[in-house]
């Protein structure tokens, strides 16, 4: 941007600009060019020598330039074209300035001028082209700076050439207010800050509802001297709430949002979201539909999921698996999980409490993503009530529950009842009973036995009765033994770990250690 | 009906040797495993260790924790056992039990090692202090 | 080593029945033996084998003892029964004898 501090091809010749010496050299002149008056000062005494003709402008009021560019528009005859060359002619004129804070006037002094350029021009006019009234014209443009007055003139100095000076024209620049990423950057006067920093840096501001998005950098500009704009650094973005439309932030529309500062545009509400209000930042949820803390809140809302479908408790002895299937409605995520409670019922009492301590699962119970698992160490004699319960991403911002039930009891063999029935210095006769209503789900016996305080073998006899005799034992010694029935489900429950011994050589019972 | 009675130094210092004796009266003393058992104050049993004396020989079983430290032995013509317990240490601060176990060790070849204790010392408050 | 759990403490109402567990590995191949302890006196055997009553032991005084867990139940609790109750068994690997660390039965009101 170009703000014009002086025009002389503007004012149609009512500037009255300074001649010296006065009535001599300079002067105005009005011609015809496509039908308009043009004004203009020449000077062309070329013939008498020592010329010295000034020509200064009225005072110009800097503004707030500092450096300001002067463009001439001028013609210059060519010394040739006079007779005999003119020998005291010349083809150049000088410009010079003067700064000072009060309009001097008439007062002129050329002491006070400080010599910018001499000015030459590129074409000169020959004979041939004023005949035919095709005159060259030519443009030179200077700078002047830095200026610190509160105003200036411009001197023209005349040294005995044919010039026509057309137009004056003095500018400084700017570099003009911007919007630019959603910045707005003001008018900036293009100034050098340096020689080697050639570049202002202008700092801009947000447009409403935009701001400098979390840890980036501030929007700033840089202002050439040329009054152009360069190389954007930083920038602004929509604030939560309002997307960019061309230069500006608008705000979200109804059933729409956006959640934070950012370049992408306002997103529509997601499913099971109330419709949102203009400028919202995020939809709400449904009554009934939540989000987690860690849901994105482009995400549509979801629920708790319903129980696990398809609860089976299939009993295996003393174990029990549990399967079951994945809930009908997940609630809209996938992260589900499975936990499994556990309650133990005493079938003469009728007294229920929980057994978490008593059993063993295959898995920990608690955040399961199979939908299986193993329960053992049951007792027998006993009713298990086992609860599968459903859980997704939401189900900690709810009370209620969703899990399915299911029911076993418990008909392992009861532990064998071991005694011991004879024995001799090298064996042992071991017998055993067990109810009679479970005898028959018994398929053989395991009887396992080792010397005590050795703790790193031992020997195992299987049995369909109900004795055994352990032999080729050491004599006096006391062996650890315990039976087992084994039934077409697996192991039944073993015995007590029993202490027998054998007879000392002596045919004493003396014990053994 | 087999009674217990114990006694021994109530207070001691850290480096010290506790010693304990436990009496029993009645009974058939070379039949049983004896036992020291001590509890810390406000905390739960803890077994010390046991002891059998049959012909000429003791059987001695202690606590892998403490064994370093116990000695447990047997005056048979006395009727007695006893506890020591070297280079003690403010954590030995406790009452300690002597007891006899509810069955004799073995019996027609049938034993019962770690059986329950039906009969307990009165219990000696020891206290390590410097 | 072999480790008895026992929960720290189980609070009951007069009259009503307490359940006192003791955890182990196995512990039902195991004999397990009860004691009752109240303060400044010697522990006292009230169960032996799981579930016998030495003479002298009230019979509301019962045990059970299956898979990895020991029961102690204490039917119709009055407030006399508030004590410490410790369990015992005898570790045939190691040949030690264990406790289990105690639980503080409180009886209600």
């Known amino acids: 941007k170009e703000v014009v501090l002086l025009d002389f091809a503007a004012m149609k010749g009512e500037l009255g600009w300074l001649t010296h010496p006065y009535g001599k050299g300079w002067d105005l002149m009005q011609n015809i060019m496509d039908d308009m008056p043009i004004y203009m000062y020449s000077v062309c005494n070329v013939v008498s020598g020592d010329q010295d003709n000034w020509l200064r402008t009225n005072w110009v009021y800097r503004e707030e330039a500092e450096r300001i560019f002067i463009e001439l528009k001028f013609t210059v005859r060519d010394c040739n074209s006079f007779p005999g060359g003119a020998s005291s002619c010349k083809e150049t004129f000088n410009l010079y300035y003067a700064e000072s804070d009060v309009d001097y006037g008439t007062n002129f002094q050329k002491r006070q001028f400080t010599k910018i350029d001499t000015i030459a021009p590129d074409e000169i006019t020959v004979s041939s082209d004023f005949e035919a009234r095709n005159v060259k014209l030519n443009v030179e443009e200077r700078m002047v700076g830095p200026l610190t007055r509160k105003g200036f003139y411009l001197a023209f100095q005349d040294i005995g050439a044919c010039v026509a000076l057309l137009s004056v024209r003095v500018y400084y620049k700017k570099c003009p207010e911007m919007l630019q990423s959603l910045a707005r950057f003001p008018e900036t006067i293009a100034v050098a800050v340096s020689d080697t920093q050639p570049l202002a840096t202008v700092a801009g501001t947000c447009v409403d509802h935009a701001v400098v998005p979390y840890g980036g950098e501030g929007p700033l500009m840089h202002c050439t001297v040329d009054g152009e704009w360069l190389v954007p650094i930083g920038q602004c973005l929509c604030q939560e709430g309002y997307e960019k439309v061309e230069d500006a932030c608008r705000a979200c529309s109804p059933g729409f949002f956006k959640s934070e500062a950012s370049e992408s545009p306002c997103l529509e509400c997601p499913e099971h979201t109330l419709p949102s209000t203009e400028g919202a930042t995020s939809c709400q949820c449904e009554e009934g539909y939540f989000r987690a803390p860690e849901d994105p809140l482009s995400m549509s809302c979801t629920r708790p999921p319903s129980a696990p479908n398809y609860l089976t408790a299939i009993g295996m002895g003393a174990k029990v698996e549990l399967r079951w299937t994945a809930p009908k409605d997940t609630g809209g995520r996938q992260d589900i999980v499975y936990s499994v409670t556990c309650e133990q019922c005493w079938p003469e009492s009728g007294e229920c409490g929980p057994c978490e301590a008593s059993v063993r699962y295959s898995e920990p119970p608690h955040a399961l993503t199979r939908t299986s698992v193993t329960v053992s160490d049951l007792e027998p004699h006993m009713n298990y009530t086992f609860a599968v319960e459903a859980r997704n991403g939401v189900s900690g911002l709810v009370t209620s529950r969703s899990f399915r039930t299911a029911s076993v009891s418990i008909n392992q063999t009861e532990p064998p009842k071991v005694r011991l029935e004879d024995r001799s210095t090298t064996s042992l006769s071991v017998t055993w009973s067990i109810p009679v209503s479970q005898q028959s789900r018994v398929w053989k016996y395991e009887v396992t036995y080792r010397k005590k305080g050795d703790a790193n073998s031992y020997n195992v006899r299987r049995t369909e009765g109900f004795s055994v005799t352990l032999d080729d034992l050491a004599p006096d010694t006391t062996y650890l033994v315990q039976v087992q029935a084994l039934t077409q489900e697996g192991q039944g429950a073993g015995s007590k770990v029993h202490e027998f011994q054998t007879l000392s050589t002596e045919g004493s019972a003396n014990m053994a250690v | 009906q087999v009674q217990l009675q114990q006694w021994g130094a109530g207070l001691l210092k850290p480096s010290e040797t506790l010693s304990l004796t436990c009496a029993v009266y009645g009974g058939s003393f070379s039949d049983y495993y004896w036992s020291w058992i001590r509890q810390p104050p406000g905390k739960g049993l803890e077994w010390i260790g046991e002891v059998n004396h049959r012909g000429s020989i003791n059987y001695n079983n202690y606590n892998p924790s403490l064994k370093s430290r116990v000695t447990i032995s047997v005056d048979p013509s006395k009727n007695q056992f006893s506890l020591k317990l070297t280079s003690v240490t403010a954590a030995d601060t406790a009452v300690y039990y002597c007891?006899?176990?509810?069955?004799?060790?073995?019996?027609?070849?049938?034993?019962?090692?770690?059986?329950?204790?039906?009969?307990w010392g009165q219990g000696t408050m020891v206290t390590v202090a410097s | 080593s072999y480790v008895l759990t026992q929960p720290p403490s189980v609070s009951v109402a007069p009259g009503q029945t307490a359940r006192i567990t003791c955890g182990g590995n196995n512990i039902g191949s195991k004999n397990v033996h009860w004691y009752q302890q109240k303060p400044g006196q010697a522990p006292v055997l009230v169960v032996y084998?799981?579930?016998d009553r030495p003479s002298g032991i009230p019979e509301q005084f019962s045990g059970s003892n299956s898979g990895n867990t020991a029961t102690l139940t204490i039917s119709r609790v009055e407030a006399g029964d508030e004590a410490d109750y410790y369990c015992q068994v005898w570790d045939s690997s190691s040949d030690h004898l264990v406790f289990g660390g105690g639980t503080k039965l409180t009886v209600l009101g």
């Open positions: 084998d799981d579930s």
């Open positions: 007891a006899k176990p509810l069955r004799p060790h073995c019996t027609n070849g049938v034993c019962y090692s770690g059986d329950a204790f039906d009969i």
